[in-house]
């Protein structure tokens, strides 16, 4: 009877190890096809919508990279509480599986648009480097479904690159105009969306727990209106020490206020960037290593 | 450690309205949805519907919008579901839950007898 | 509304069993499928989201798999602690959905 039990034991361990390696196997050979998948999508052109049908649904793009997908692109998402999926650039290099949510890139997008563009979103999403703004709505589904990072890549004229991460990036619903509330900051392009740099700025120039702006709707906390004045829409205060959303000026400018694409603690108020790009990814991110 | 405490058991007469709770601790509380799900003695669960603490925004389950109401109270991190009109068929464990893609809190329920 | 069928109420099983409970959905809900267990005057416990991945601290012995309709929880080596009432769910789309349940019992 023991021996029997032994056997059993041995031969559990047996279908066991069978198992792991035929759920190996497995991995290995959807990966390999999603591979070739991905290669035929990939024309190699400026133009990087990648279609997957109706396969499976997905909720970000780092449900699509750890699925197998590692090419960047254009893919459908559909977050928890959206009524329906849209387009999305997933950004599967610096780690992989980032939702890019919004881009600039060269000046061909108008961004000083209104209330109802910036909520549903607006741009490019066709082309590997088109401009965008993914929609307020989008960007609350995103955000409450998980915790996110939010990584900001930051580009100037004379070639240099910084970046700024913030944990647990959420964006509010319609109902409190999409208040912006961010965690703590990493980087090297300085903390300008805290407002940490200065103490005494902080409380006008801190873009936490502000709400979103547009032209036709003023929720800063300025006389005047700011998103009128910067001529974009973004989380104002009085109004702000970074503006990703604002005129697309080569480098150095002037103006009449420092409407231009701003990040404070890297460039000051009066050197608009030559690229951006806001994505995020969950702060638990782990990828899926075949 | 995310928590949901919520209130105690109730016995209440048909027709009356009862208000439940269900305390958060351990996050920010605005900044996630809670639902509320229904499970009557030895049954599955229903989905009645949830509310963004962040502004109050709430959505139903069609078969709950006349008999579910729901609010909170931020300044105490509390979700609170009022239920009216009830009758035997409400007589149930009544659940909140922060549900995210990859995680899932519950409440620990609240029993609700509805009885004359 | 996405209804989840778990056509079996009630399992008979054995310590060390392979046990394999199903759920399917009456539409494509891709892989965006939740797995709870749940025993008497207890809340439902979150074993397996997004249809094949198992929640921190849940034993290896639990596998989730499928997508689209059709989903499966396995138990690869039953233990007396694993008696329970196991739900699927669906959020795919709201409202949430789940399954009616399938209680595994002993033989």
């Known amino acids: 009877l023991e021996d029997c039990a032994q056997e059993q034991m041995r031969l559990r361990a047996q279908v066991r190890l069978l198992e792991t390696r035929v759920k190996q196997q497995q991995v290995k050979i959807k990966q390999l096809l999603q591979e070739n998948e991905v290669q035929f999508l990939d024309k190699g052109d400026e133009n990087t919508v990648i279609d997957l049908g109706s396969k499976r649904q997905y909720a970000d793009c780092s449900e699509i990279f750890n699925d197998g997908y590692k090419l960047s692109g254009f893919y459908k998402i559909k977050p928890l509480q959206s009524p329906a999926e849209f387009s999305v650039y997933c950004d599967m290099s610096d780690g992989g599986g980032w939702t890019v949510i919004q881009r600039r890139s060269d000046g061909s997008e108008n961004f000083n648009r209104g209330w109802k563009d910036y909520e549903n979103g607006f741009g490019n999403f066709v082309q590997k480097h088109g401009e965008y703004w993914l929609g307020n709505k989008n960007l609350h589904f995103l955000t409450t479904q998980e915790d996110y990072t939010l990584k900001i890549d930051l580009a100037d004229f004379e070639k240099n690159s910084r970046y700024a991460q913030y944990k647990n990036f959420k964006v509010g619903d319609e109902k409190n105009f999409y208040e912006l509330n961010i965690g703590e900051y990493s980087g090297t392009a300085g903390d300008s969306l805290a407002g940490n740099f200065h103490p005494e700025v902080q409380w006008w120039a801190s873009h936490q727990r502000m709400k979103f702006s547009t032209w036709d709707r003023d929720h800063d906390n300025y006389e005047g209106n700011c998103a009128e004045e910067d001529q974009s829409g973004w989380w104002f205060n009085r109004c702000h020490s970074a503006n990703l959303n604002g005129v697309y000026y080569s480098g150095p400018y002037t103006a009449k206020t420092d409407n231009g694409i701003v990040w404070y603690t890297w460039h000051g108020w009066w050197y608009s960037l030559k690229s951006v790009v806001m994505k995020i990814r969950p702060n638990d991110f782990i990828p899926n290593v075949i | 450690e995310v928590q949901l405490q919520q209130s105690g058991p109730e016995l209440v007469k048909p027709g009356a309205s009862v208000k439940i709770s269900c305390k958060a601790s351990?996050?920010?509380?605005?900044?996630?949805?809670i639902n509320w799900v229904k499970q009557k003695p030895g049954q599955g669960l229903e989905w009645i519907g949830w509310?963004?603490?962040?502004?109050?925004?709430?959505d139903h389950n069609e078969k709950f919008k006349d008999k579910a109401t729901l609010t909170v109270d931020t300044s105490s991190s509390t979700a609170y579901m009022q239920l009216s009109s009830l009758t035997s068929e409400d007589t149930a464990v009544y659940f909140c839950l922060r549900f995210l893609l990859r995680s899932a809190y519950w409440g620990q329920g609240t029993l609700v007898t509805v009885s004359a | 509304d996405i209804v989840m069928t778990q056509s079996q109420k009630f399992m008979s099983t054995s310590v060390g069993d392979r046990v394999s409970i199903t759920c399917k959905a009456s539409?494509?809900?891709?892989?965006?499928v939740a797995w709870y267990q749940q025993k008497p005057g207890q809340s439902p416990k979150l074993l397996i989201y997004?249809?094949?991945n198992r929640y921190t601290g849940v034993p290896d012995r639990f596998t989730g798999s499928g997508s689209g309709t059709d989903f499966t929880l396995t138990i690869s080596n039953m233990q007396s602690e694993d008696l329970a009432d196991y739900f699927c769910q669906q959020y795919s789309s709201y409202p949430l959905t789940f399954g009616a349940g399938t209680k595994l019992e002993l033989k």
């Open positions: 351990g996050y920010t509380f605005t900044d996630y949805y």
């Open positions: 509310i963004y603490p962040g502004s109050g925004n709430t």
């Open positions: 997004s249809a094949s």
């Open positions: 539409q494509n809900v891709g892989t965006a």
